[in-house]
Amino acid sequence: MRRGPRSLRGRDAPAPTPCVPAECFDLLVRHCVACGLLRTPRPKPAGASSPAPRTALQPQESVGAGAGEAALPLPGLL
């Protein structure tokens, strides 16, 4: 559980998190889990304002999602 402080090197991106390809990184408990266990934000309608640039551990976009919408948490080696 996330009871203690987290450490980031200044404002740098964190070190890569080694999730196997079928897994995604759960940001809330900080470990790799099956991607299907995580739920991304609701799809935005086409034409909605584009989201902020993705960070290393944000969900990635996929074909079939609404314009610029995150579809799945980023799997594999992050």
Partner: antibody, heavy 117, light 111 residues
Framework: EVQLVESGGGLVQPGGSLRLSCAAS????????WNWVRQAPGKGLEWVGY???????YYNPSLKSRFTISRDTSKNTLYLQMNSLRAEDTAVYYC???????????WGQGTLVTVSS | DIQMTQSPSSLSASVGDRVTITCRAS??????????MHWYQQKPGKAPKLLIY???DLESGVPSRFSGSGSGTDFTLTISSLQPEDFATYYC?????????FGQGTKVEIK
């Protein structure tokens, strides 16, 4: 579209127990984070705790000893067992589903629990 | 626990006004380059409604007059042009660390 329906609220005497239910449809409770949030009359929101996809629970430390969150995956239903109830537990209790970032984007309508003699 | 402090606690405004609500966390709610800060709107007798997640991302279906900004410990919710349906109470919430915590709320009333 996720839909959440709470039930089980009502009047209970101090020291009593109550179990609230939250029936989910539109998604499996074995995905994501399923929360209970409460709101005392005229007050703000207070997070009670969550149960996640793996069945792991985490609670507001001020409530942990008296409140227990559980689930029945066969019924796709979330529960909040409340013991040793006090007058200050009087509140509307909401269940809410949180996304990848912990933002609660689906909420039930709430169920009122009144603790009074 | 991370304490969330909203200001003001209440405000009076008119339709068309630009409204700004601030939320300060007792420690940073940033991690992985993400701000784990969210904003909700609640009307009397109704469940809260998510407006903004991850500090600045507009929830699906929420009007574009709502926007969020900030990072670290200081965050802002802005309503660019207040509409009659926007009179409500607004809450910030952090999910950076357990236990998740809410601000005390800001009530936006009609002037």
């Amino acid at each position: 579209e996720v839909q959440l329906v709470e039930s089980g609220g009502g009047l209970v005497q101090p020291g009593g127990s109550l179990r609230l239910s939250c029936a989910a449809s539109g998604d499996s409770i074995t995905r994501g984070y399923w929360n209970w949030v409460r709101q005392a009359p005229g007050k703000g929101l207070e997070w009670v705790g969550y149960i996640n996809y793996s069945g792991t629970t985490y609670y507001n430390p001020s409530l942990k000893s008296r409140f227990t969150i559980s689930r029945d995956t066969s019924k796709n239903t979330l529960y909040l067992q409340m013991n040793s109830l006090r007058a200050e537990d009087t509140a509307v209790y909401y269940c809410a589903n949180a996304n990848y970032y912990g933002a609660m984007d689906y909420w039930g309508q709430g169920t009122l629990v009144t603790v009074s003699s | 626990d991370i304490q969330m402090t909203q200001s003001p606690s209440s405000l009076s405004a008119s339709v068309g006004d630009r409204v700004t609500i601030t939320c300060r966390a007792s420690e940073s709610v940033d991690d992985y380059g993400i701000s784990f800060m969210h904003w909700y709107q609640q009307k009397p007798g109704k469940a809260p409604k998510l407006l903004i997640y991850r500090a600045s991302d507009l929830e699906s279906g929420v009007p574009s007059r709502f926007s969020g900004s900030g990072s670290g410990t200081d965050f802002t919710l802005t309503i660019s042009s207040l509409q009659p349906e926007d009179f409500a109470t607004y809450y910030c919430q952090q999910t950076s660390k357990d236990p998740w915590t809410f601000g005390q709320g800001t009530k936006v009333e009609i002037k």
